[in-house]
């Protein structure tokens, strides 16, 4: 069976400052292969996180990706700004060279209020 | 710099217990799984137990489950392998190894010598 | 179990594959650990397929395809002769295992 990426929110709203999470599980991890979330979609969509080395600022897993059977791929934003505000998307891929997009979620509409 | 240095090898008599240590350093230890691997004398390498960066989930080869137990002290930067029951087929080099984000290893320690003989 | 060719020779300035198979390519990720003398620290060649860690120089990379995986020195050089071990992460039962190793001699 194919695997299904799973954003149960619609939409989040976050104040200014604040910190918001978007949550994202997988029903499998097969086949291996990166999850990444982005903001937007198309040629234009902007890498926010990635659970591979990289480090990205402002933004953390939420639980322990390195645990072998895991499949919450949740993110933390800390001190959104408006800026932030758009569509988040958590994508699966299938290893390869480059890895191909196999699934997406269904989107997290984050919606920043001023302060 | 990056450093992986295993401690606690020795000889010991079969059926006698070890309990081998890694110190980790040049890295944030706790957001890494590890893992441990060994190699006999004259063989190729064997993977024996992984455990996540958290400490919650241990994982282990069949042949030395039951035996070995994989553990972590994030807050000394440090692994460990407790051994028990240990057989003369336990002599090897025991290496510990950072994981990467799918479980295969970027940097290895300089491995500890584990000799088990009567 | 993965399969990799016991030896492989090549001359100073030749390109060297070295094939690994047995893994799956829907669940198996692999990796190439290079170890100069047995007992010294194992290095990590490429890990992930085809990632290589910075400190190691480009005339080594790597593939994987089907159920195989192959590593690639591009213009050996004398001081790659090792022991190459294949590796490899399987998904669905969350193992890692290695090949038995492949000698490689630069003539």
């Known amino acids: 069976t194919e695997v299904k990426v799973i954003q149960p929110e619609k939409s989040v709203s976050v104040a200014a400052g604040d910190s918001t999470v978007l949550n994202c599980t997988l029903t499998s991890l097969l086949p291996v292969g990166p999850i990444r979330w982005y903001r937007g979609v198309g040629q234009s969509r902007q890498l926010i996180y990635s659970f591979t080395t990289e480090h990205f600022p402002r933004v953390t897993n939420v639980s322990d990706a390195t645990k072998r059977s895991n499949l919450d791929f949740s993110i933390r934003i800390s001190n959104v700004t408006p800026e932030d505000a758009g569509t988040y998307y958590c994508v699966k891929f299938q290893r390869g060279s480059p890895d191909t997009e196999i699934q997406s979620g269904g989107g997290t509409e984050v919606y920043v209020l001023a302060k | 710099d990056l450093q992986l240095v295993e401690s606690g090898g020795g000889v010991v008599r079969p059926g006698e217990s070890l309990r081998l240590s890694c110190a980790a350093s040049?890295?944030?230890?706790?957001?890494?799984?590890m893992s441990w691997v060994r190699q006999a004398p004259g063989k190729g390498l064997e993977w024996l137990a992984g455990?996540?960066?958290?400490?919650?989930?241990?994982y282990y080869i069949d042949s030395v489950k039951g035996r070995f137990t994989i553990s972590r002290d994030n807050s000394k930067n440090s692994l460990y392998l407790q051994m028990n029951s240990l057989t003369a087929e336990d002599t090897a080099v025991y290496y510990c190894a950072r994981e990467t984000w799918n479980h295969l290893f970027d940097y290895w320690g300089l491995g500890t010598l584990v000799t088990v003989s009567s | 179990a993965l399969t990799q060719p016991a030896s492989v020779s090549a001359n100073p300035g030749e390109t060297v594959k070295i094939i690994c198979s047995g893994g799956d390519y829907y669940s198996t990720y692999y990796g190439w650990y290079q170890q100069k003398s047995p007992g010294s620290a194992p290095v990590t060649v490429i890990?992930?397929?085809?990632k290589r860690p910075s400190d190691i120089p480009s005339r080594f990379s790597g593939s994987a395809s089907g159920s195989a995986a192959t590593l690639t020195i591009t213009g050996v050089r004398v001081e790659d002769e090792a022991v190459y071990f294949c590796?490899?992460?399987?998904?669905?039962?969350?193992?890692?295992?290695f090949g038995a190793g492949t000698t490689l001699t630069v003539l």
């Open positions: 890990h992930s397929d085809d």
């Open positions: 590796g490899a992460y399987d998904g669905r039962t969350y193992i890692n295992t």
């Open positions: 455990i996540s960066a958290g400490g919650s989930d241990t």
């Open positions: 040049g890295f944030t230890f706790s957001s890494y799984a």
